[in-house]
Interface confidence: medium
Amino acid sequence: SERCDDWGLDTMRQIQVFEDEPARIKCPLFEHFLKFNYSTAHSAGLTLIWYWTRQDRDLEEPINFRLPENRISKEKDVLWFRPTLLNDTGNYTCMLRNTTYCSKVAFPLEVVQKDSCFNSPMKLPVHKLYIEYGIQRITCPNVDGYFPSSVKPTITWYMGCYKIQNFNNVIPEGMNLSFLIALISNNGNYTCVVTYPENGRTFHLTRTLTVKVVGSPKNAVPPVIHSPNDHVVYEKEPGEELLIPCTVYFSFLMDSRNEVWWTIDGKKPDDITIDVTINESISHSRTEDETRTQILSIKKVTSEDLKRSYVCHARSAKGEVAKAAKVKQKVPAPRYTVELACGFGAT
């Protein structure tokens, strides 16, 4: 057979589907690897072929499209399961070819079991809602294309194991779930179960996502440096260890990169010859506001080091701030017998 452009196993598209539910899986070639769509390929006389490798096997085999009730079928560039079975788990390959052209890609499909409370090994998408930000909605994901618009499915929403009804601030509205005013207690896993008829059978689609309530942009402020501050002076003798914490509070900001760094005499610690170590720790509030602490440490400080300028800097999408630490050399206590005697004119 002629050479085939093999895109390998596309592990970026680890597809997970629930057991005993319909699944429609588009061939990734047209979405991510080729510059033309299925219609164009079909018009040009290319044929799409599907095959698979079962879990824990090496042998590629054709997909059986002659199962009872057309349990597995292909429609254009979509592979359909109506419904899936646990042993459908494996690596699936779609190959586009004619006599002069060939391109193929494989992808893993995992059929997952769920319990009565929708718990499963499924990786859940996270949807962030702003705290106290007015009405916000989440939409039951990945249900497009399963039934025609003429079919009116029933949709039931759950929080964890509980059907959502008479919740204070959460209202099911068909495919949408509305949060009148998001609160931290709305954090959790939300599941929509979509039930629809097809050819005399009833199918269920289960979709779970995680809601995380985060700080609102209307409350967001530029970074706040809590330490160093004007109240604390780092007074050290040469030879002692100098430890200066830089503690910065960052409001939650979607997709903001929070940065904290020290400069010593205007330079980054990496660009200076003194032996400095910096340790960072990060903690988060219930609304994902972030506190970053970077502790600057000089094991044995010299009198030269105690004359340097130590500045903590912080930056987020809201702005940049800086604060200098007050560092000084401790004045040694007088040695009374010699120094005071000299002060009285004794020799």
Partner: antibody, heavy 122, light 107 residues
Framework: QLQLQESGPGLVKPSETLSLTCTVS??????????WGWIRQPPGKGLEWIGS???????DYNPSLKSRVSISVDTSKNQFSLKLSSVTAADTAVYYC??????????????WGQGNLVTVSS | DIQLTQSPSFLSASVGDRVTITCRAS??????LAWYQQKPGKAPKLLIY???TLQSGVPSRFSGSGSGTEFTLTISSLQPEDFATYYC?????????FGGGTKVEIK
């Protein structure tokens, strides 16, 4: 008027498990803006948060006690419970259950039980 | 963990005095702070949440202020029933923590 009432033994032997139940009356434990918490106070000392639970069963625990603590909820009985294993004399305290309200967006323990003194002694 | 340092630990005052209690957080907690009053043998009672919002039914002589790391509880005119221990609590992040308490005694 919401009320919380702790119940359980007042005396527990060292190395055994302390078990307390909080019964909620005058309101539903399944309210979507409430968390339910346990707080303790050793004699003559300050308050220490043990953990909280939401009606769906999701929990948050104090890391200092996490390996020994378990909080559960029974919505049908409008109760939530605390279990603290391998107790020592240091666990002697008044144990309070409380409702943590989130309806304002800012939590606070606005309703408390009267407290249950648990002494760990052989 | 976020540490809360209350000062003073003890406070002697007379009826009618203006009393101020301070709570300092080891890191910024926005306005996620509550104040409680506790009398001997009783459960704590919520006075203020969100740093400055008075809980329903609490007398207006109690007020709270502050944000970030510095918070204050003020009793504008101390009444006989106000002699008690006061605790601050941060609800910003887990684990939830309380201050060490401030005991307000009769002078």
């Amino acid at each position: 008027q919401l009320q919380l009432q702790e119940s359980g033994p007042g005396l527990v032997k060292p190395s055994e498990t302390l078990s307390l139940t909080c019964t909620v009356s005058g309101g539903s434990i399944s309210s979507s803006t409430y968390y339910w918490g346990w707080i303790r106070q050793p004699p003559g000392k300050g308050l220490e948060w043990i953990g909280s639970i939401y009606f769906t069963g999701s929990t948050d625990y104090n890391p200092s006690l996490k390996s020994r603590v378990s909080i559960s909820v029974d919505t049908s009985k409008n109760q939530f419970s605390l279990k603290l294993s391998s107790v020592t004399a240091a666990d002697t305290a008044v144990y309070y259950c409380a409702k943590e309200d989130d309806s304002s967006g800012y939590y606070s323990f606005d309703y408390w039980g009267q407290g249950n003194l648990v002494t760990v002694s052989s | 963990d976020i540490q809360l340092t209350q000062s003073p630990s003890f406070l002697s005052a007379s009826v009618g005095d203006r009393v101020t209690i301070t709570c300092r957080a080891s890191q910024g907690i926005s306005s996620y702070l509550a104040w409680y009053q506790q009398k001997p043998g009783k459960a704590p009672k919520l006075l203020i949440y969100a740093a400055s919002t008075l809980q329903s039914g609490v007398p207006s002589r109690f007020s709270g202020s502050g944000s970030g790391t510095e918070f204050t509880l003020t009793i504008s005119s101390l009444q006989p029933e106000d002699f008690a221990t006061y605790y601050c609590q941060q609800v910003n992040s887990y684990p939830l923590t309380f201050g060490g308490g401030t005991k307000v005694e009769i002078k």
